[in-house]
Interface confidence: low
């Protein structure tokens, strides 16, 4: 009679995490008598997965009834597969011996590949806000997927980005993998409503990629532009001066009026108007009693935005001229104005 062969017909078995793997094995003969054992890996460090003779293997069930005398099907099912179960499984026939059974013949092995979905990508931006024209970095991370092949793309408002670096770890063989990508994004003044999206495609996702997003509103700081103007006279000895604070983001802003360098009033932006690009406008006004001043007055609108160094804009108010004659010719009134922008 021909010598027993152990046949593992499947070179590889692909299973999604959480599912059941079927590992097929048949013997060509009932002789010699002895049990079958399943191992993961080969050599001295191999791991026992199932022993027909003895032991408790709660995740393993046999496909056929091994207690039947004529059974030659030693296929097993392993339930609730995780990436840690990946490896090559060997069906090994033992010959009955005394005191111990002796390994007789092994199958060629079946490679179990576990397909595990990547976790939802998590996108994180810089710790501190940055201003337009600056380049900021965003990171995207996803974990726990297998096999290693994965595709990651970055988008800003639907447009694919090209300036990014991606690493999949570990480099060598592993039960599961992680991906880490860093993208560089140049901010513009219009980015308050912008989104950065990290998209991960993997064979387990059946063509429906996972996405992680970050809102640039949490990253960008748009510094305000200031304009100080003198309004038409309201009363014989009063001048109304306004400070228009335009296109800033976020809303956190404090404004201080200075008269000849002395603090006149401080207020916090409250009733702001929102522009369609997401930035804000705000206006503050100061009523100056001209009769209280003998000399020209230097009015300064000083704005501290989002904890940054103050930005200021000044306006020279000529006391010598009659208020009614000053009108609202801001170009003339701003002559000699001092603009100092600190970002």
């Amino acid at each position: 009679e021909e010598e027993l062969q152990v046949i593992q017909p499947d070179k590889s078995v692909l299973v999604a995490a959480g599912e059941t793997a079927t590992l097929r094995c048949t013997a060509t003969s009932l002789i010699p008598v002895g049990p079958i054992q399943w191992f993961r890996g080969a050599g001295p460090g191999r791991e026992l997965i199932y022993n027909q003779k003895e032991g408790h293997f709660p995740r393993v069930t046999t496909v056929s009834d091994l207690t039947k005398r004529n059974n030659m099907d030693f296929s097993i099912r392993i339930g609730n597969i995780t990436p840690a179960d990946a490896g090559t499984y060997y069906c090994v026939k033992f010959r009955k011996g005394s005191p111990d059974d002796v390994e007789f013949k092994s199958g060629a092995g079946t490679e179990l590949s576990v397909r595990a979905k990547p976790s939802a990508p998590v996108v994180s931006g810089p710790a501190a806000r940055a201003t337009p024209q600056h380049t900021v970095s965003f990171t995207c991370e996803s974990h726990g997927f297998s096999p290693r092949d994965i595709t990651l793309k970055w988008f800003k408002n639907g447009n694919e980005l090209s300036d990014f670096q991606t690493n999949v770890d570990p480099v060598g063989e592993s039960v599961s993998y992680s991906i880490h990508s860093t993208a560089k994004v140049v901010l513009t003044r219009e980015d308050v409503h912008s989104q950065v999206i990290c998209e991960v495609a993997h064979v387990t996702l059946q063509g429906d990629p996972l996405r992680g997003t970050a809102n640039l509103s949490e990253t960008i700081r748009v510094p305000p532009t200031l304009e100080v103007t003198q309004q038409p006279v309201r009363a014989e000895n009063q001048v109304n001066v306004t400070c228009q604070v335009r296109k800033f983001y976020p809303q956190r802003l404090q404004l201080t009026w200075l008269e000849n360098g002395n603090v006149s009033r401080t207020e916090t932006a409250s009733t702001v108007t929102e522009n369609k690009d997401g930035t804000y406008n705000w206006m503050s006004w100061l009523l100056v009693n001209v009769s209280a001043h003998r000399d020209d007055v230097k009015l300064t609108c000083q704005v501290e935005h989002d904890g940054q160094p103050a930005v200021s804009k000044s306006h020279d108010l000529k006391v010598s001229a009659h208020p009614k004659e000053q009108g609202s010719n801001t170009a003339a009134e701003n002559t000699g104005s001092n603009e100092r922008n600190i970002y």
Epitope: K11, L14, A108, R115, P147, R148, D149, G207
Partner: antibody
Amino acid sequence: AVTLDESGGGLQTPGGALSLVCKASGFTFSSYNMGWVRQAPDKGLEFVAGIYTGSDAGLSTTYGAAVQGRATISRDNGQSTVRLQLNNLGAEDTGIYFCTKSAGGCSDYNCDAYIADSIDAWGHGTEVIVSS
Amino acid sequence: AVTQPASVSANPGETVKITCSGSSSYYGWYRQKSPGSAPVTLIYDNDKRPSGIPSRFSGSKSGSTNTLTITGVQADDEAVYYCGNEDNSYVGIFGAGTTLTVL
């Protein structure tokens, strides 16, 4: 008898595209993995592409590093043909292209054969020359 | 990567062994008599012989090394012998080839 007949070779223009067809006969085509292997002048064998029988998306096609992104392999089980399309040709694509049959195939969840380790039949080859 | 010796030589009637090492579980052996001619499969899946291949060609695997054994080498066996396998992404890999010279 198993026969694999390649066609579509010849002189090709750099930057252009080629389409090779392998007509198979003598076996149940749909049950077997198929592939393309090439040999540049005075060089060894190089795996180009493989196509599997199973519908499993992760293992339906594979490509060698030199042609990844430029090559498309497809099969028509009704016509018993396997096609290789290669774009953006360069001088390094010059060589003889062999159609191969594997000893087995894949189902959705298992394989009893791959490509380069399981070839049991080769075509005679079709020569491709990329030159201006 | 697949590693095989660049050349081996043997006298007629001797036994020659050509080794191929890599990380795969399965290997095939292919013979090419002249460059550009169609290769012939000697062994696939480690130890299987296609019909028509003489039994003096055999394949075996031990660990990560696969061996093609040719017993009773003949002058007609002069050729380049390639081993092939698959990497972890199922992409085929061929060795650089071993030239067998029959002395």
